[in-house]
């Protein structure tokens, strides 16, 4: 189901990444320098910014982030 409208619930933040709010609804996600070999799987649809620098991601499949607008 969809997550309830709330100002007190933390939106999904991928494990080990750092997240902070970007306005009322959106989330900035920093997954840099984590040794990742693939994209984090549980990205919030409310992600406005994603930093994947300094990782080991060698290739991306077509449409790698279908949940993001």
């Amino acid at each position: 189901g969809s997550s309830p409208r709330s100002g007190v619930l933390l939106r999904g933040c991928p494990t080990h990444c750092h997240c902070e709010p970007d306005g009322r609804m959106l989330l900035r996600v920093d997954c840099s320098d984590l040794g990742l070999s693939e994209l984090p799987s549980n990205l919030s649809v409310f992600t406005s910014y994603l930093d994947l620098s300094m990782n080991n991601i060698s290739q991306l499949l077509p449409n790698p982030l279908p949940s993001l607008r």
């Epitope: 309830p4 100002g7 007190v8 933040c13 750092h18 997240c19 902070e20 959106l26 989330l27 549980n42």
Partner: antibody
Framework: QVQLQQPGAELVKPGASVKLSCKAS????????MQWVKQRPGQGLEWIGE????????NYNQKFKGKATLTVDTSSSTAYMQLSSLTSEDSAVYYC??????????WGQGTTLTVSS | DIQMTQTTSSLSASLGDRVTISCRAS??????LNWYQQKPDGTVKLLIS???RLQSGVPSRFSGSGSGTDYSLTISNLEEEDIATYFC?????????FGGGTKLEVR
């Protein structure tokens, strides 16, 4: 700087109602939710509910439905919580706090409510 | 409702000590955990969000870790100003719930 001003104390008789206030300043009032939290003497923190000042949409802890009513006055950047049918169990410190996407980043100083005849 | 348990209600430590405060959730909260500090005068401050994100202005001696149901707050080098009560809070589901608090005292 961000400030949430709450009265220091309120003394109310059992059975009566009280309306606690929380005046916000230093930020855009309608851009952040307002949370209300209860703390009994020597106890932990208990979430009462929250309100979005932009349209007064609110969520309540089931435990406080019928006890607490949250409202806002955007013209004065003030959030209110009315507590009804007061008993000694309602004697506590009540905090307001602003939040955005889960970050409850600024808290008021709290209002000490005493329910006594 | 998700129950948050801080098994240690009070903790005595010496200045300069490394102190760890633990918090357990009754179910997986997916790292959606905040830590708050409440000073003796009642002032409440957010220290850490999302399990490990240090808030702006919070000293780097504070750190958060954990996953699933078990989380902890560590103060690496205890200072006088850290004497307070620390609460964990889950932000995974409504209603958000808090741990009972751990009161930190100087030995």
């Amino acid at each position: 700087q961000v400030q949430l001003q709450q009265p220091g104390a309120e003394l109310v008789k059992p059975g009566a109602s009280v309306k606690l206030s929380c005046k916000a300043s230093g930020y855009t009032f309608t851009s952040y939710w307002m949370q209300w939290v209860k703390q009994r003497p020597g106890q932990g923190l208990e979430w009462i509910g929250e309100i979005d000042p932009s349209d007064s949409y609110s969520n309540y802890n089931q435990k406080f439905k019928g006890k607490a009513t949250l409202t806002v006055d955007t013209s004065s950047s003030t959030a209110y919580m009315q507590l009804s049918s007061l008993t000694s169990e309602d004697s506590a410190v009540y905090y307001c706090a602003r939040s955005l996407s889960g970050y409850v980043d600024y808290w008021g100083q709290g209002t000490t409510l005493t329910v006594s005849s | 409702d998700i129950q948050m348990t801080q098994t240690t209600s009070s903790l005595s430590a010496s200045l300069g000590d490394r102190v760890t405060i633990s918090c357990r959730a009754s179910q997986d909260i997916s790292n959606r955990l905040n830590w708050y500090q409440q000073k003796p005068d009642g002032t409440v401050k957010l220290l850490i969000s999302y399990r490990s994100r240090l808030q702006s202005g919070v000293p780097s001696r504070f750190s958060g870790s954990g996953s699933g149901t078990d989380y902890s707050l560590t103060i690496s080098n205890l200072e006088e100003e850290d004497i307070a009560t620390y609460f964990c809070q889950q932000g995974n589901t409504l209603p958000p719930t808090f741990g009972g608090g751990t009161k930190l005292e100087v030995r």
